[in-house]
């Protein structure tokens, strides 16, 4: 095979916190030309070797490029729970996709508070 993508399939983070979305592409021959990050079908960000980074305006206050070709997703909400996809465009070698499932959990403070209230 020309290349492979490794990623943590399932990750979790606390509401209000941040998480790093990271895919690792390895190949003996193919070079990465672009990486697309999507939340389900919605574009999060693009990294292009030629053009640099682009973060979709709807996420620009919460998504920070890096580390490396990954993303740091900040100020997480419960609505951010779901599937995230990295798409690596390579040459030669074509396109490789990785999938991450992010589970955003209530913060421990919220959970403790709720327990005390009950």
């Amino acid at each position: 095979t020309a290349g492979t993508i490794d990623t943590k399939r399932n990750i979790s983070a606390e509401e209000g916190g941040s998480v790093i979305l990271q895919c690792h592409f390895s190949s003996d021959t193919a070079e990465v030309t672009q990486v697309d990050w999507k939340q389900q079908d919605q574009l999060l960000a693009i990294y292009s070797v030629d053009l640099g980074w682009h973060v979709a305006s709807v996420f620009s206050d919460r998504v920070v490029p890096g580390p490396s070709l990954g993303l740091t997703f900040q100020s997480l909400t419960m609505n951010d729970t779901g599937e995230y996809f990295c798409t690596y465009h390579t040459y030669p070698g074509g396109i490789y996709k990785g999938r991450i499932f992010l589970k955003v959990q209530e913060s421990s403070d919220d959970r403790n508070g709720l327990a005390q209230f009950q």
């Epitope: 030309t33 672009q34 693009i46 292009s48 070797v49 030629d50 053009l51 640099g52 980074w53 682009h54 973060v55 890096g66 490396s68 465009h89 040459y91 030669p92």
Partner: antibody, heavy 121, light 112 residues
């Protein structure tokens, strides 16, 4: 001599369409990423669109969904199909080559002379 | 988008004197993985397309006279023309490409 020559500009009404072409010569066109950059009269420069040597495409938000970039490596040509044109698209449109010597510098090293697009009723 | 702010808007300098143009980006353009600043400078003469002068903030493009030099890192950059020549009259633009490319508004250099 390394050269880029644009054509296809002209006067078009708002909502209309235009197709720009850029003919490349003097270098191995298929090996280079290419761009369209525009300049409104008396204004600064604005990157519009990009196509890599392998066909990966990107657009500025201001033209996404209206403009389509393409290339024909057999003809050493770059194209920009412009639909749903607006008055604010009025500009000189340059094709520009990405500099790829060394590692990617993300700079534009060769520019054409430009073609003028005027959107007006 | 990163906003690139150039100053001054225009500059009048005597022949043989130094011209200094500043460019400030709203975010850092230093890419930590290779320690390169993705900042380029272009020269545009009337009726002509832009010409690449400098990339990676300080690397001169082949064929560009050594009186042109670039410096700076992170968010603050400078283009210096050490000894202005008549043929240097032009508008100068900075361009970042840490994010998708954006250009500064330009600085017009004239002879005093």
């Amino acid at each position: 001599e390394v050269q880029l020559v644009e054509s296809g500009g002209g006067l078009v009404q708002p909502g209309g369409s235009l197709r720009l072409s850029c003919a490349a010569s003097g270098f191995t066109f298929s090996s280079y990423s290419m761009n369209w950059v525009r300049q409104a009269p008396g204004k600064g420069l604005e990157w519009v669109s990009y196509i890599s040597s392998s066909g990966t495409i990107n657009y500025a938000d201001s033209v996404k969904g209206r403009f389509t970039i393409s290339r024909d490596n057999a003809k050493n040509s770059l194209y920009l199909q412009m639909n749903s044109l607006r008055a604010e698209d009025t500009a000189v449109y340059y094709c520009a080559r990405h500099r790829i010597a060394d590692s990617p510098s993300r700079a534009f090293d060769i520019w054409g002379q430009g073609t003028m697009v005027t959107v007006s009723s | 988008d990163i906003v690139m702010t150039q100053s001054p808007d225009s500059l009048a300098v005597s022949l043989g004197e130094r011209a200094t143009i500043n460019c400030k980006s709203s975010q850092s353009v230093l890419f930590s993985s290779n320690n390169k600043n993705y900042l380029a400078w272009y020269q545009q003469k009337p009726g002509q397309p832009p010409k690449l002068l400098i990339y990676w903030a300080s690397t001169r493009e082949s064929g560009v006279p050594d009186r042109f030099s670039g410096s700076g890192s992170g968010t603050d950059f400078t283009l210096t023309i050490s000894s202005l020549q008549a043929e240097d009259v032009a508008v100068y633009y900075c361009q970042q490409s840490y994010f998708f490319p954006t250009f500064g508004g330009g600085t017009k250099v004239e002879i005093k």
